[in-house]
């Protein structure tokens, strides 16, 4: 991927829209939308005060860890859906899109240098352990996906792209 493709706001906006659509189709869906188990996902709440004061490397750690855990969670959701007796087609479609979207975002972040940022000392050592919550429905899983993109990921890319502009 081109190194700064993710710095084009329309790129992230596309994935955000997909995540929002996925969240919307699961609104009011009970029968097909239970995960039947608790899946660990990143806590997407952002402490804006603390975030702004973090070094970009520390932000990268949080984003990279969160993205990894979220990808794992969505893959688990996909596996549960595949193994269910009658997977609901619209849900299947959006889960597949989310898996593909998270893969692409991982590639785009790697191209931006987020992985390098995340493992460079001293930031990696001082990063707080990733806060997590659990999701027991696809709605909550998609909500976490959407909030993660709107929150930490967007804040990080904004700062990383701005820093890279100088």
């Amino acid at each position: 991927a081109p190194p700064r493709l993710i710095c084009d706001s329309r790129v992230l906006e596309r994935y955000l829209l997909e995540a929002k659509e996925a969240e919307n189709i699961t609104t009011g869906c009970a029968e097909h939308c239970s995960l039947n188990e608790n899946i660990t996902v990143p806590d997407t709440k952002v402490n804006f005060y603390a975030w702004k004061r973090m070094e970009v490397g520390q932000q990268a750690v949080e984003v990279w860890q969160g993205l990894a855990l979220l990808s794992e969670a969505v893959l688990r959701g996909q596996a549960l859906l595949v193994n269910s007796s009658q997977p609901w087609e619209p849900l299947q479609l959006h889960v597949d899109k989310a898996v593909s979207g998270l893969r692409s975002l991982t590639t785009l972040l790697r191209a931006l240098g987020a992985q390098k940022e995340a493992i460079s000392p001293p930031d990696a050592a001082s990063a707080a352990p990733l806060r997590t919550i659990t999701a027991d429905t696809f709605r909550k899983l998609f909500r976490v996906y959407s909030n993660f993109l709107r929150g930490k990921l967007k804040l990080y890319t904004g700062e990383a792209c701005r820093t890279g502009d100088r």
């Epitope: 997407t44 709440k45 952002v46 402490n47 804006f48 005060y49 603390a50 702004k52 004061r53 909500r143 909030n147 709107r150 929150g151 967007k154 804040l155 904004g158 701005r162």
Partner: antibody, heavy 116, light 108 residues
Framework: QVQLVQSGAEVKKPGASVKVSCKAS????????MSWVRQAPGQGLEWMGW????????NYAQKFQGRVTMTRDTSISTAYMELSRLRSEDTAVYYC?????????WGQGTLVTVSS | SYELTQPLSVSVALGQTARITCSGD??????VYWYQQKPGQAPVLVIY???KRPSGIPERFSGSNSGNTATLTISRAQAGDEADYYC???????????FGGGTKLTVL
């Protein structure tokens, strides 16, 4: 002790500009973002924008974009907020507020009156 | 842009429990901050990160947040609690802070 001391009250005519200062003491000025919040008489708090004193980068509330400019002078640990094209609705107390884990330290406020 | 809605006023009998609400779209997914402001004074924070109290704030003050509503609870209300209370969070779409309209608490 840690404190923020703001400049005195101002009376301005509509269409003019006002520049309010906020002098920080008792802490490292460049280590904390600074926000500006205003409060019209009998009204609620309204966030205007923030400045990062270390880098000088800013972010303004949509409502004030194009009219507000936040700057700083690190040599004298002072933040400034300038509001242009004043109108009567801009009559308010303007506060600077340090961002710690929240808005932890506030200035005493500067009353800006816009009147013809 | 993101909006936070508070009731204009809340009344509570002395010694009873007051609850002040702050509504916003999916506010349960955000941290919420509560400020107390007395006439002629700058605001003072009473709750941060949704449910934490800074030192010096009595245990009577507590916060919670779920769904579309955050709540500031003041138990055993005292005359000195009379003030305006503001909730605050942020708009992630614009990276900006947002205050609620404020609630005037009256202790009867």
């Amino acid at each position: 002790q840690v404190q923020l001391v703001q400049s005195g009250a101002e009376v301005k005519k509509p269409g003019a500009s006002v520049k309010v200062s906020c002098k920080a003491s008792g802490y490292t000025f460049t280590s904390y973002y600074m926000s500006w919040v205003r409060q019209a008489p009998g009204q609620g708090l309204e966030w205007m924008g923030w400045i990062n004193p270390l880098k000088g980068n800013t972010n303004y509330a949509q409502k004030f974009q194009g009219r507000v400019t936040m700057t700083r002078d690190t040599s004298i640990s002072t933040a400034y907020m300038e509001l242009s094209r004043l109108r009567s609705e801009d009559t308010a107390v303007y506060y600077c507020a340090r961002e710690g884990m929240y808005f932890d330290i506030w200035g005493q406020g500067t009353l800006v009156t816009v009147s013809s | 842009s993101y909006e936070l809605t508070q009731p204009l006023s809340v009344s509570v009998a002395l010694g009873q429990t007051a609850r002040i609400t702050c509504s916003g779209d999916s506010i349960g997914d955000k941290y919420v901050y509560w400020y107390q402001q007395k006439p002629g004074q700058a605001p003072v924070l009473v709750i941060y990160d949704t449910n934490k109290r800074p030192s010096g704030i009595p245990e009577r003050f507590s916060g919670s947040n779920s769904g579309n509503t955050a709540t500031l609870t003041i138990s055993r209300a005292q005359a000195g609690d009379e003030a305006d209370y503001y909730c605050q969070s942020w708009d992630l779409d614009f990276n900006t802070y947002v205050f609620g309209g404020g609630t005037k608490l009256t202790v009867l």
